[in-house]
């Protein structure tokens, strides 16, 4: 089931899904001056089963001036540099996404895609948080959030992460950064 909202925002931190659960949607969005091709897909969907999942549909953008011209999905290096996402630019630890059954990898960029990717997650999705450059992590627990179903409603768990400026002193002296593995917490659904 779709999560009604996004993972919680942590000041000076970004989140990243290491892999996307089957059922996740990614909006097909184009950058300014470009539009979806005529009859182009509205979104990509991670489909499949526990053994193999892949992204259904393809996002394609075309110049607003030339509405019907199809642009192929080949990323331009200079465009990729300018693309920001709400997620982290580099994963916190190497993860073999293909080894996670029922999950899809990060979809490859498409030409002239929007600067921010908007994913719609499903129950059981886990995302990992990392402080942005110039800030360091103070952990009280796992720096991750899971979308859970409770009493028929979806909610994200609160990540136990505080990002502090490099010059600030730790509020949690002696606290060590936990080694969070991608399967570190079960993707459980709570029922009532």
């Amino acid at each position: 089931e779709l999560c009604d909202d996004d993972p919680p925002e942590i000041p000076h931190a970004t989140f990243k899904a290491m892999a996307y659960k089957e059922g996740t949607m990614l909006n097909c969005e184009c950058k300014r001056g470009f539009r979806r091709i005529k009859s182009g897909s509205l979104y990509m969907l991670c489909t499949g089963n526990s053994s193999h999942s892949s992204w259904d549909n393809q996002c394609q953008c075309t110049s607003s001036a030339t509405r019907n011209t199809t642009k192929q999905v080949t990323p331009q290096p200079e465009e990729q540099k300018e693309r920001k996402t709400t997620e982290m630019q580099s994963p916190m630890q190497p993860v073999d996404q293909a080894s996670l059954p029922g999950h899809c990898r990060e979809p490859p960029p498409w030409e002239n895609e929007a600067t921010e990717r908007i994913y719609h997650f499903v129950v059981g999705q886990m995302v990992y948080y990392q402080c942005v450059q110039g800030y360091r992590a103070l952990h009280r627990g796992p720096a991750e959030s899971v979308c859970k179903m409770t009493h028929g409603k979806t909610r994200w768990t609160q990540p136990q992460l505080i990002c502090t400026g490099e010059m600030e002193t730790s509020q949690f002296p002696g606290e060590e950064k936990p080694q969070a593995s991608p399967e570190g917490r079960p993707e459980s659904e709570t029922s009532c």
Epitope: L2, D4, D5, D6, M25, N27, E29, C30, R32, R36, S39, G40, S41, L42, Y43, L45, T47, D56, N57, A114, E116, I118, H120
Partner: antibody
Framework: DVQLQESGAELAKPGASVKMSCKAS????????MHWVKQRPGQGLEWIGY????????EYNQKFKDKATLTADKSSSTAYMQLSSLTSEDSAVYYC????????WGQGATVTVSS | DIQMTQTTSSLSASLGDRVTISCRAS??????LNWYQQKSDGTVKLLIY???RLHSGVPSRFSGSGSGTDYSLTISNLEQEDIATYFC?????????FGGGTKLEMK
């Protein structure tokens, strides 16, 4: 809870314009498209267009391109639709609805065009 | 534009019945088919998206199936609260288009 609260019923004269609103709550407004859908009495549903409140990017059904203008105000989490040059054909219930798969709908706002 | 056709505009059923409502697209829509329920007061709810995925909070008696151009919505054990009009909608490409609706009534 996700909620979309539409403005009240509108009575307008032919040739006039109306602007209806849709106040969103219970989710991050800028992360979901906002669609608008028309339903004439006793008839089916017609998609008018959508706006991405984050970027103000809009897409319209060609049929409504010159009729509807979609806008959004991030600060108040409110989407708007203005209908211009009203005729009796524009008398209908208009719904705002959010999302990629259009998962939550407003209660509908009735527009009546009459002289 | 893709045309969506619901050939049955109204159908009568009894409590506990298994009801199937069908929908046909004018071209292959690759499973990007949603089902909506509209109550007599105008309230619209998403029931199923992408052919068979149940939206949160929707009772499990609702199910969807189909592929290519032909799709169906099944209510396995009809309840009084299911009396409504049901619309299919293709959500693959713009403009999203709706079927004409099937009004479900009690016998």
């Amino acid at each position: 809870d996700v909620q979309l609260q539409e403005s009240g019923a509108e009575l307008a004269k032919p040739g006039a314009s109306v602007k209806m609103s849709c106040k969103a709550s219970g989710y991050t407004f800028t992360r979901f498209w906002m669609h608008w859908v028309k339903q004439r009495p006793g008839q089916g549903l017609e998609w008018i267009g959508y706006i991405n409140p984050s970027t103000d990017y809009t897409e319209y059904n060609q049929k409504f391109k010159d009729k509807a203008t979609l806008t959004a105000d991030k600060s108040s989490s409110t989407a708007y639709m203005q209908l211009s040059s009203l005729t009796s054909e524009d008398s209908a219930v208009y719904y705002c609805a959010r999302g990629t798969v259009v998962d939550y709908w407003g209660q509908g706002a009735t527009v009546t065009v009459s002289s | 534009d893709i045309q969506m056709t619901q050939t049955t505009s109204s159908l009568s059923a009894s409590l506990g019945d298994r009801v199937t409502i069908s929908c046909r697209a004018s071209q292959d829509i690759s499973n990007y088919l949603n089902w909506y329920q509209q109550k007599s007061d105008g309230t619209v709810k998403l029931l199923i998206y992408y052919t068979s995925r149940l939206h949160s909070g929707v009772p499990s008696r609702f199910s969807g199936s189909g592929s290519g151009t032909d799709y169906s919505l099944t209510i396995s054990n009809l309840e009084q609260e299911d009396i409504a009009t049901y619309f299919c909608q293709q959500g693959n490409t713009l403009p999203p288009t709706f079927g004409g609706g099937t009004k479900l009534e009690m016998k």
